[in-house]
Interface confidence: low
């Protein structure tokens, strides 16, 4: 099956790469604008220059295009703990990231939040913290993993999942409680 092409894609495919079809005259192919610029006026005729203008401050185009307006620069989401890695330029959007020893938790494709990497206190690092994933910890004996922290088995209640991991400790406590009862 041939994928359905949008009108703009259909029009562009008639012209060689790096050119687009004139919207008012389909016999003319105009040269696309370089990244960092946008289309101000279509080329007047074959072999004539397209009128491209540089993006204004606060806007950009990251690839060759025939957009009538530049795209607005993204703003890093401070409430998500994001920091600016590199500023927006006419040909590149703002790059946002997290601070050192933090990872990105993606709420959706484009929205991430920064969280501290787990330190694995009372445990060891099984997998190091990565850009998009928290540290994976393995806990020492007598500790169990809760909310990515190694917690003492003395905090393990019988109703919780940790009973499997803290089985010897739980049995000891149970034995003490049961002594002297029928």
């Amino acid at each position: 099956l041939v994928p359905h092409l949008g009108d703009r894609e259909k029009r562009d495919s008639v012209c060689p790469q790096g050119k687009y079809i004139h919207p008012q005259n389909n016999s003319i192919c105009c040269t696309k604008c370089h990244k960092g610029t946008y289309l101000y006026n279509d080329c007047p005729g074959p072999g004539q220059d397209t009128d491209c203008r540089e993006c204004e401050s606060g806007s950009f185009t990251a690839s060759e295009n025939h957009l009538r307006h530049c795209l607005s620069c993204s703003k890093c989401r401070k409430e998500m703990g994001q920091v600016e890695i590199s500023s927006c330029t006419v040909d590149r959007d703002t790059v946002c990231g997290c601070r050192k020893n933090q990872y990105r938790h993606y709420w959706s494709e484009n929205l991430f939040q920064c969280f501290n990497c787990s330190l694995c206190l009372n445990g060891t690092v099984h997998l190091s913290c990565q850009e998009k994933q928290n540290t994976v910890c393995t806990c020492h004996a007598g500790f169990f993993l809760r909310e990515n922290e190694c917690v003492s088995c003395s905090n393990c209640k019988k109703s919780l999942e940790c009973t499997k991991l803290c089985l010897p400790q739980i049995e000891n406590v149970k034995g003490t409680e049961d002594s002297g009862t029928t």
Partner: nanobody, 119 residues
């Protein structure tokens, strides 16, 4: 034991309003930021809103900004989400959550309340 109990969901027409509540217990409510997240049918979790422990800072997803208002009453240990100008795309199960911001996004969740926006 930490408990979060959401209420206030239901069926509403597009353009209508709902107010969700989340009654919290088992922890010191005033110490923590709280948040709302939602899950539309067959989709992943979407962050909706967040409020600081003292309610002086509120944050919203672009999709709900200007329509939803998050608030809290620390004397009642209750979190609220006022939802106005509801749209079909707001249909989801809404979860209230404690926002510790330590290692993971949310440590504790409620059971959720279903909001259906349909004519």
């Amino acid at each position: 034991e930490v408990q979060l109990l959401e209420s206030g969901g239901g069926l509403v027409q597009p353009g209508g309003s709902l107010r969700l509540s989340c009654a919290a217990s088992g922890f010191t409510f005033v110490k923590y930021s709280m948040g709302w997240v939602r899950q539309a049918p067959g989709k992943g979790l979407e962050w909706v809103s967040q409020i600081s422990n003292t309610a002086d800072r509120t944050y919203y997803a672009h999709s709900v900004k200007g329509r939803f208002t998050i608030s809290r009453d620390n004397s009642k240990n209750t979190l609220y989400l006022q939802m106005n100008s509801l749209r079909a795309e707001d249909t989801a199960v809404y979860y209230c959550a404690i926002y510790t911001g330590r290692w993971e996004p949310f440590n504790y969740w409620g059971q959720g309340t279903l909001v259906t926006v349909s004519s």
